[in-house]
């Protein structure tokens, strides 16, 4: 659920208040620990390979 | 509105060494991983170096074709980051781009710096 | 390394008309949720410009002209229809690990 007074995010992306901006829920697989994750419905499903 | 503004370049020897910089603004720099790609003829398009955030102590990661050779680095209080190019060989013409991305895609690229190795 | 195949290598193609441009990868790209497959499009002496992401996502200000599909090991992008100011070269790029890498390109240009 998106905070107050932030737009709404499209389905697939999280509200960062960090960015200021909806980012993809996709991101998290490489970046797990971004704090708009935890908006994202479900844990990213595969760790980042380096 | 989004800018990153690249400048060096131009033409050195075999053997030689070449720094590109890179500035940007309208993002917010810290947050993201940063990165040089190619372009060359010969190559197309090839990812060369990322350097990635402070928080995890700046990781960086490179092409094997450019490992031990050249190093990318950042100034997060200056919007910055550089590539500096060593032992530079004629295969490493092309033209660089400076890239930036939060964890996948190049969502912005700077207008591109030429680089020519050559005797 | 994950090498993505991108064919054809050039394509003439009727105003008005559909051009679709495959990518192959060597590998599976894409999790249960998720295709680690973007697009990008270059005019000549310019950089690359970011089109589509996640294999089906455009971004924002990219004409619903472009469109993205594909899963697993097979992408397409297709434009349609193909208006004068799509000539270009057509490139994929996958973020499934390090290093990234992009396909060899597609040319685009108008019959």
């Known amino acids: 659920e998106q905070a107050p007074g932030t737009a709404p995010c499209s389905r697939g992306s999280s509200w960062s208040a960090d960015l200021d901006k909806c980012m993809d829920c996709a991101s998290c697989r490489a970046r797990p620990h971004s704090e708009f994750c935890l908006g994202c419905a479900a844990a990213p499903p595969a760790p980042f390979r380096l | 509105e989004v800018k990153l503004q690249q400048s060096g370049g131009g033409l050195v020897q075999p053997g030689g060494s070449m720094k590109l910089s890179c500035v940007a603004s309208?993002?917010?720099?810290?947050?993201?991983?940063m990165n040089w790609v190619r372009q060359s003829p010969e190559q197309g398009l090839e990812w060369i170096a990322e350097?990635?955030?402070?928080?995890?102590?700046?990781?960086?990661h490179y092409a094997e074709s450019v490992k031990g050779r050249f190093t990318i680095s950042r100034d997060d209080s200056k919007n910055s980051v550089y590539l500096q190019m060593n032992n530079l060989r004629p295969e490493d013409t092309g033209i660089y781009y400076c890239?930036?991305?939060?964890?996948?895609?190049?969502?912005?690229w700077g207008q591109g710096t030429t680089l020519t190795v050559s005797s | 390394d994950t090498v993505l195949t991108q064919s054809p290598a050039s394509l003439v193609v009727s105003l008005g008309q559909r051009a679709t441009i495959s990518c192959r990868a060597s590998?599976?790209?894409?999790?249960?949720?998720?295709?680690?497959i973007h697009w990008y499009q270059q005019k000549p002496g310019q950089p690359p410009k970011f089109l589509i992401k996640?294999?089906?996502n455009r971004d924002s200000g990219v004409p619903a002209r472009f469109s993205g599909s594909g899963s697993g090991t097979d992408f397409t992008l297709n434009i349609h229809p193909v208006e004068e100011d799509d000539t270009a070269i057509y490139y994929c790029?996958?973020?499934?690990?390090?290093?990234?890498?992009f396909g060899a390109g597609t040319k685009l240009e108008l019959q």
């Open positions: 890239a930036c991305r939060y964890a996948d895609y190049f969502d912005h």
């Open positions: 309208g993002f917010t720099f810290s947050y993201y991983w």
């Open positions: 350097i990635r955030l402070q928080s995890n102590d700046y990781p960086t």
């Open positions: 996640y294999a089906s």
């Open positions: 590998q599976s790209v894409s999790t249960s949720d998720y295709s680690y």
């Open positions: 790029q996958h973020s499934w690990e390090i290093p990234p890498t």
